[in-house]
Structure formats: structure tokens, C-alpha cells
């Protein structure tokens, strides 16, 4: 029952150009190229995109023209391999060009860099941005796509088109406003934060598909869509899952034109069939395509249908469970996950997947036992501790968050995670712990029924960031173990890690704790990052330091920064007071 067109096209590139239109075609090819060749200058990419676009137009005019029958991977790969500086800029990635498709594309995918060595994007003055926008709107927006795509090589391409549309709207509106900055800056901040979140969410989907396979992704999708569309029947959910899996497989595989086209088809199908899917889709379906797709992806859960009987009858109490399981394994387990998820919008997706895995494991064991029914009769009792563990963890951490506030809560997590995995680089520990800490303000405000899906599924996204960053430069067996053993048990695995007793404390380096007057001109966020970087380094030097010791040092540090930033001769203050602070801290921590 897939919605996607199966008819063969003589020219795939012509087909996609006609389906998507020139503007979206060019934008998606630019995103694809920037996600593959992350170091190439903007102008080089624009040139390549223009060449591909001109070629596509010749194929639209005549699908039988030379090379028009080639696959998109062949066409795009050939184009990427024309880049003159490939070996100098990308090193061994140039070897991909010696391969044939599909190995060449797989090779490019393997070289995508989650943490490319690119300068931080600095936002120019508002007037400068507005001038650039008015001077050449098209180039300005292309540059936005390019800069985001190269820094986020797994960004969900059709969603990036939606962000670009909002980016354009912000400039169109605000560059005419009386107070341009007041209008524009909050919008850009919102787009930046939403963009980072969107990128991280998509990165988890791609990791799920690439590291754990299609079955893992489909299980995640069944659980999530069943929560979101509890009135939809199993066949409908299964169909949506199949189509959604195809869309994300394509995007994660670099097939961005197919992905965007299929996503549009899926949105169309959902809106044409909303009566049998969800009562919450009406507003989404009235929007234009990009907004519609985004809206559907974020739509709130529909109300649970009335009259749902207990699951125990079919999945525990029946003596025919093993027969049903043996003869229709995937349907039976899929139905179990669907039925459980639609009844539990209050559970995280990862918890639902743990329950389904526990159920499957129990059936595997019990259906081979002498008395299967007696063996599996108490399977739902095994769920209780699995449900209570995240509930208790969230309760404790929300209490801590409410007591400390976001910054100090992040600090508590920084200390906790540095002690667990001190080998991980300081920037990664700071970034990940700061994001973990944001769970407080994101989720603790919710009522009990919404806390777990908010918190634990968000933590899965953040811990995946740690996993992909660590995979690039592996330094900790414990991180590797938690990241690779089970996708759904990553969070419990990290939660269960205690202090790493094998860690040899880092040598003390005074330079790490030397600060200068430039800290005073930083934004509050940047200042926090500086302090949190110092905190991680402290813990790496003294992993056995108590909370109280660390708090005392950090309080002294905050007072030191505040004092020197108020001083007339800031640099002298930082030099002299800094030495005293380092000495006092060493004494306090017994370094």
C-alpha cells in the first residue's frame, strides 16, 4: 500500500526536476553537495549546482539525451569527482572516486564529518545582513543552505528548505521594520535553536538506520506513530511506517531529491486520508507543502479511542500466544507494540521499545519451555521495573533542576558525566552535558503524563550526539559499549555508569586555568561555556573531588571573573588574581 510512484522513468534527473520544480531542485542539489564536500567554498558548489541544473533541463527537454538515463548517484558522484582539489582538501575521500556506484556513494557517506573543522558562524550586524539580503536575495539564501548543510551533514533536507523559507520570511519582514534588530534577532535565535534540535533529531534517525538497521527504525516509527495516531488502525500505521522509513532511508543515504519528493507524496497521502489517521491534522493540511510536512511531523497526539480492552487477554492470558507468535512473528510483535504504544502516550518511545524487546525475549524463552503459558503468564510484571526506572530518574532530576536552575543543573551533569567518561574530550563533554541539562527547562514544566516522552526521547537524541562525536575519535570503551550494544538502552547504560576507577587523573596545567580580559566581552552563554570548560578540566584533574569542593572552587571562579571584569585594569587583575585563584583551588582540591 505504499504511496510512492513506481512507474519507471527514462530519466531520473528529469523526473525529479519536474516533480520538485527548479527552485527546490537547485536547493536540494546544493544541500547534497555541501553535505558531502563540507570544506569546498560556496562559489565552487554554486558552480557545480548550476552545471547539474543545466544538464537536468536538457533531460527535461529530451529524456533520451546523452547521459540522461544515468542514476542520480552516478550523475552527482561524477560531478563531485570533478573537484580539482579533492585530494588536497579531503585526503583519502578522494579514493572514493576510483570506485563504481553504489560503492562510491557509500564511500562518500562514510566520510561525512559530524564535527567538521569549520569556523563558528559569526552573525554580522543586522544592517550588513539586510544589505546583503537586498543586494542578492538568491545568493544570500543559498549561502544559508550551504552553511547549515556543511556543518550538519545529516540535516533533513526537505526540512532545511522549510527553515530557509522561514529565514527568508524573517529578513523580508524585519529588514523593513523600524527596529530591524528587535524584529530580526529573536527570529534568528529561534531558527538557530530549532535548527540545532532538528539536526540532532535527524542524526538519531540516520544513526538508527545505519547502525541498527531498518527493523530498528521501523520499530521506533511504529511506537511513535501509534502514540501520535492512536485512532489509526494497525494497517494504516504499518503503511505510514513503511513510507516514512523509505523517506528517511533516502535522506540518510544522500538521496535528497527522492527523499523530498517522497516526503511530499507522504504528506499528500496523510492529508487525503486524515479521517482514518488523526483528528489533529486539519490545520496542518491547510498549509503549503513545506509547512504542511513540518506541521504533520510535529502534530500533537490524537486522543486515545474509547473502549480499548486490556492487552493481557491477547498477549498474556491466551494459551495461543506461542502459536500466534510462531506463525506470524513480525505481525504479532508489531501489533503488540502498536497496541501498547497507542495506550501509552505517557511513555517514551525508547521505553515502549524496551517493553517490546522484553516481551519478545520472554516469548523466545517461554515458547520453548515445557509449559509456555505458565512461563509467560507473568511477563507484564517484568515491565514494572522498566517503567519505574525512567519515572524515578526523571522525578529526581526534575527536582534537582528545580532546585538548581539550568546553569547549575548543567554543571551537576558535567561533573557526573566527566566522572563516568573522563577520557572524552572536554568540548564534547561540555556540549553534551549542556544539552543534557536543557532537558530540565524543556521537559520538567510538563505534567507527569508528558514528562517521560519529552525527557527520555530528548536524552536519546543528545546521547546520540555523544555517540557520533565519539565514534569519530574513540577514546572510551565504556562510551563505545553504551553506544553500540542497544539503541534503546543507551540512556540506561550511561545512567548506570559509575565513576571510572581506572582513569588516571590528568596532569595539572596552569594554562588551562588562565583567563584573560576577553571573557568580559563574551555573551552570558559563552561565559558559561568557559566556566564549564574549566569545571570539566578540574574534574579531570581531580576525579575524586567532592561536590562541595567543586562548588567552592566554582564560586571562587565566578567571583574572580566578576571582580576582574569590573576592574579598571582588567588584564592585570586577571593575571594577578588568576594566579591566586589557581593556587587557592589547588589547595582546596589537594592538587
Amino acid at each position: 500500500r505504499g504511496v510512492f510512484r513506481r512507474d519507471a522513468h527514462k530519466s531520473e534527473v528529469a523526473h525529479r526536476f519536474k516533480d520538485l520544480g527548479e527552485e527546490n531542485f537547485k536547493a536540494l542539489v546544493l544541500i547534497a553537495f555541501a553535505q558531502y564536500l563540507q570544506q569546498c567554498p560556496f562559489e565552487d558548489h554554486v558552480k557545480l549546482v548550476n552545471e547539474v541544473t543545466e544538464f537536468a533541463k536538457t533531460c527535461v527537454a529530451d529524456e533520451s539525451a546523452e547521459n540522461c538515463d544515468k542514476s542520480l548517484h552516478t550523475l552527482f558522484g561524477d560531478k563531485l569527482c570533478t573537484v580539482a582539489t579533492l585530494r588536497e582538501t579531503y585526503g583519502e575521500m578522494a579514493d572514493c572516486c576510483a570506485k563504481q556506484e553504489p560503492e562510491r556513494n557509500e564511500c562518500f557517506l562514510q566520510h561525512k564529518d559530524d564535527n567538521p573543522n569549520l569556523p563558528r558562524l559569526v552573525r554580522p550586524e543586522v544592517d550588513v545582513m539586510c544589505t546583503a539580503f537586498h543586494d542578492n536575495e538568491e545568493t544570500f539564501l543559498k549561502k544559508y543552505l550551504y552553511e547549515i548543510a556543511r556543518r550538519h551533514p545529516y540535516f533533513y533536507a526537505p526540512e532545511l528548505l522549510f527553515f530557509a523559507k522561514r529565514y527568508k520570511a524573517a529578513f523580508t519582514e524585519c529588514c523593513q521594520a523600524a527596529d530591524k534588530a528587535a524584529c530580526l534577532l529573536p527570529k534568528l535565535d529561534e531558527l538557530r535553536d530549532e535548527g540545532k534540535a532538528s539536526s540532532a533529531k535527524q542524526r538519531l534517525k540516520c544513526a538508527s538506520l545505519q547502525k541498527f538497521g531498518e527493523r530498528a527504525f521501523k520499530a521506533w516509527a511504529v511506537a511513535r506513530l501509534s502514540q501520535r495516531f492512536p485512532k489509526a488502525e494497525f494497517a494504516e500505521v504499518s503503511k505510514l511506517v513503511t513510507d516514512l522509513t523509505k523517506v528517511h532511508t533516502e535522506c540518510c543515504h544522500g538521496d535528497l531529491l527522492e527523499c523530498a519528493d517522497d516526503r511530499a507524496d507522504l504528506a499528500k497521502y496523510i492529508c487525503e486520508n486524515q479521517d482514518s489517521i488523526s483528528s489533529k491534522l486539519k490545520e496542518c493540511c491547510e498549509k503549503p507543502l513545506l509547512e504542511k510536512s513540518h506541521c504533520i511531523a510535529e502534530v500533537e497526539n490524537d486522543e486515545m479511542p474509547a473502549d480499548l480492552p486490556s492487552l493481557a487477554a491477547d498477549f498474556v492470558e491466551s494459551k495461543d500466544v506461542c502459536k500466534n507468535y510462531a506463525e506470524a512473528k513480525d505481525v504479532f510483535l508489531g501489533m503488540f507494540l502498536y497496541e501498547y504504544a497507542r495506550r501509552h502516550p505517557d511513555y517514551s518511545v525508547v521505553l515502549l521499545l524496551r517493553l517490546a524487546k522484553t516481551y519478545e525475549t520472554t516469548l523466545e524463552k517461554c515458547c520453548a519451555a515445557a509449559d509456555p503459558h505458565e512461563c509467560y503468564a507473568k511477563v507484564f510484571d517484568e515491565f514494572k521495573p522498566l517503567v519505574e526506572e525512567p519515572q524515578n530518574l526523571i522525578k529526581q532530576n526534575c527536582e534537582l533542576f528545580e532546585q538548581l536552575g539550568e546553569y547549575k543543573f548543567q554543571n551537576a551533569l558535567l561533573v557526573r558525566y566527566t566522572k563516568k567518561v573522563p577520557q572524552v574530550s572536554t568540548p564534547t563533554l561540555v556540549e553534551v552535558s549542556r544539552n543534557l541539562g536543557k532537558v530540565g527547562s524543556k521537559c520538567c514544566k510538563h505534567p507527569e503524563a508528558k514528562r517521560m516522552p519529552c525527557a527520555e526521547d530528548y536524552l536519546s537524541v543528545v546521547l546520540n550526539q555523544l555517540c557520533v562525536l565519539h565514534e569519530k575519535t574513540p577514546v572510551s570503551d565504556r562510551v563505545t559499549k553504551c553506544c553500540t550494544e542497544s539503541l534503546v538502552n543507551r540512556r540506561p547504560c550511561f545512567s548506570a555508569l559509575e565513576v571510572d576507577e581506572t582513569y588516571v587523573p590528568k596532569e595539572f596545567n596552569a594554562e588551562t586555568f588562565t583567563f584573560h580580559a576577553d571573557i568580559c566581552t563574551l555573551s552570558e552563554k559563552e561565559r558559561q561555556i568557559k566556566k564549564q570548560t574549566a569545571l570539566v578540566e578540574l574534574v579531570k584533574h581531580k576525579p575524586k573531588a567532592t561536590k562541595e569542593q567543586l562548588k567552592a572552587v566554582m564560586d571562587d571562579f565566578a567571583a574572580f571573573v566578576e571582580k576582574c571584569c569590573k576592574a579598571d585594569d582588567k588584564e592585570t587583575c586577571f593575571a594577578e588574581e588568576g594566579k591566586k585563584l589557581v593556587a587557592a583551588s589547588q589547595a582546596a582540591l589537594g592538587l
Epitope: 488502525e233 494497525f234 494497517a235 494504516e236 482514518s276 473502549d307 480499548l308 480492552p309 486490556s310 493481557a312 487477554a313 491477547d314 498477549f315 492470558e317 491466551s318 494459551k319 495461543d320 502459536k323 500466534n324 506463525e327 506470524a328 505481525v331 504479532f332 501489533m335 497496541e339
Partner: antibody, heavy 120, light 108 residues
Framework: EVQLVESGGGLVQPGGSLRLSCAAS????????MNWVRQAPGKCLEWIGH???????YYATWAKGRFTISRDNSKNTVYLQMNSLRAEDTAVYFC??????????????WGQGTLVTVSS | AFELTQSPSSLSASVGDRVTITCQAS??????LAWYQQKPGQPPKLLIY???DLTSGVPSRFSGSGSGTDFTLTISSLQPEDFATYYC??????????FGCGTKLTVL
């Protein structure tokens, strides 16, 4: 509109065969266990059997051998094949939808029924 | 397979009366019992499932209770439209299901 419509009933001679159909609209049969229930004139409800979402059919002890349930998902229809019919098989035959794909009950959705008369 | 015994098989009552119908299973079926109402020429209508859960749209004068082997359907105050035949159904112990033989409720 979500509904079930039975058809194929009628007069049949003892020893004869009949195939009843139950066409579903407004939902997909493949998501549910689909049941056949009968009721002889002025008598109790009697469950015949069902076919579940895994395409596994189960029958009441008395129905095994003579009655076969199948379905065609593309036609969104479930069937009841009845062989070696006897006078005591005279009844209104209902099709009913289970609560889930592997459910034996409860049945919230029923068809209006089709009358089967076995007589010479 | 288990059997369900419904009692009484027939019952006469007046509008406003409180009526109780019982259903006994030959073995424990936990809470897996449903109650149906059937009127002549119509299919059964689900009233109660899982022994005590009221189906949406069914008046609250209908209630169910019990678990294991003994179950009851109670109509707290009979209304004219309640005169019909009531069936219990046990399910969930296997992939088969059983109906009781009905209680015919008539006007006194």
C-alpha cells in the same frame, strides 16, 4: 462509514456447500481478527471461528473440518466456506470484528447477518 | 473450552426496577467477560467489556462486575428500551470464545 455487510446466504440442500462473504468498509480487515457467529432461530449465539491478523484461523470444536474461514485483504472481505451442511446449520450468520488483530473479544462491530436455510 | 452458564434464562421486570443477571464460567477467565444486548432482528450490541468497562455511548445505568468465574450485569433502573435478550461472552483464555445462552428480559 465503518460497517460490515454479510452476503451469500440462502436456501441450500442438506449435504450442500455455501460460501458466505463479509465485506468491510471504512476500515482495513487486515488489522483485526474477524469472527463468524451464528444464531439459530430463537436460540443462543454460537461462535464459529475467526481469522486473525497473522492469517491464522481458529474454530470452535464443533466447526472444525466442515467450516473454513479465509480472507482477501485486497477485496477487504472475509469468507466462511461451509460444507456438508445439515438442517441444524440453519441460522442467521453474523460477521463481527474483534477488538484487535489477535482478539477473541469483545465484538463492538457486527454485520446485520445473512440467513442460511438448510432444507430439502 | 470453558462454558458459560447464564441465569436466569428469562426474567420479567417493570420499568424502574433494578435487575441483575449473572454469568458463571466453568473455569477462571480473569476479567475477560463482555455483555451484549440483542433485540429481535438486530445483531448484538456491546454494553460492557473486560467485566466492568462501559462501552462509550451506553447509558450509565448498565454496570458490570466480577472476575474469575462469577460475573454480574446490573441495570440500576429499567427503561422501556431495555427489554431485550442479554448475552455474556468469555474471551481471552485462548483464541476461542464462548457465549452464554442468554437472558430474556420481558415486561412484567
Amino acid at each position: 462509514e465503518v460497517q460490515l455487510v454479510e452476503s451469500g446466504g440462502g436456501l441450500v440442500q442438506p449435504g450442500g456447500s455455501l460460501r458466505l462473504s463479509c465485506a468491510a468498509s471504512g476500515f482495513s480487515l487486515s488489522s483485526y481478527a474477524m469472527n463468524w457467529v451464528r444464531q439459530a432461530p430463537g436460540k443462543c449465539l454460537e461462535w464459529i471461528g475467526h481469522i486473525n491478523a497473522g492469517d491464522i484461523a481458529y474454530y470452535a470444536t464443533w466447526a472444525k473440518g466442515r467450516f473454513t474461514i479465509s480472507r482477501d485483504n485486497s477485496k477487504n472481505t472475509v469468507y466462511l466456506q461451509m460444507n456438508s451442511l445439515r438442517a441444524e446449520d440453519t441460522a442467521v450468520y453474523f460477521c463481527a470484528r474483534g477488538a484487535g488483530g489477535f482478539s477473541t473479544g469483545p465484538f463492538k462491530l457486527w454485520g446485520q447477518g445473512t440467513l442460511v436455510t438448510v432444507s430439502s | 473450552a470453558f462454558e458459560l452458564t447464564q441465569s436466569p434464562s428469562s426474567l420479567s421486570a417493570s420499568v424502574g426496577d433494578r435487575v441483575t443477571i449473572t454469568c458463571q464460567a466453568s473455569e477462571s477467565i480473569n476479567s475477560r467477560l463482555a455483555w451484549y444486548q440483542q433485540k429481535p432482528g438486530q445483531p448484538p450490541k456491546l454494553l460492557i467489556y473486560d467485566a466492568s468497562d462501559l462501552t462509550s455511548g451506553v447509558p450509565s445505568r448498565f454496570s458490570g462486575s466480577g472476575s474469575g468465574t462469577d460475573f454480574t450485569l446490573t441495570i440500576s433502573s429499567l427503561q422501556p428500551e431495555d427489554f431485550a435478550t442479554y448475552y455474556c461472552q468469555g474471551y481471552g483464555g485462548s483464541s476461542t470464545t464462548t457465549f452464554g445462552c442468554g437472558t430474556k428480559l420481558t415486561v412484567l
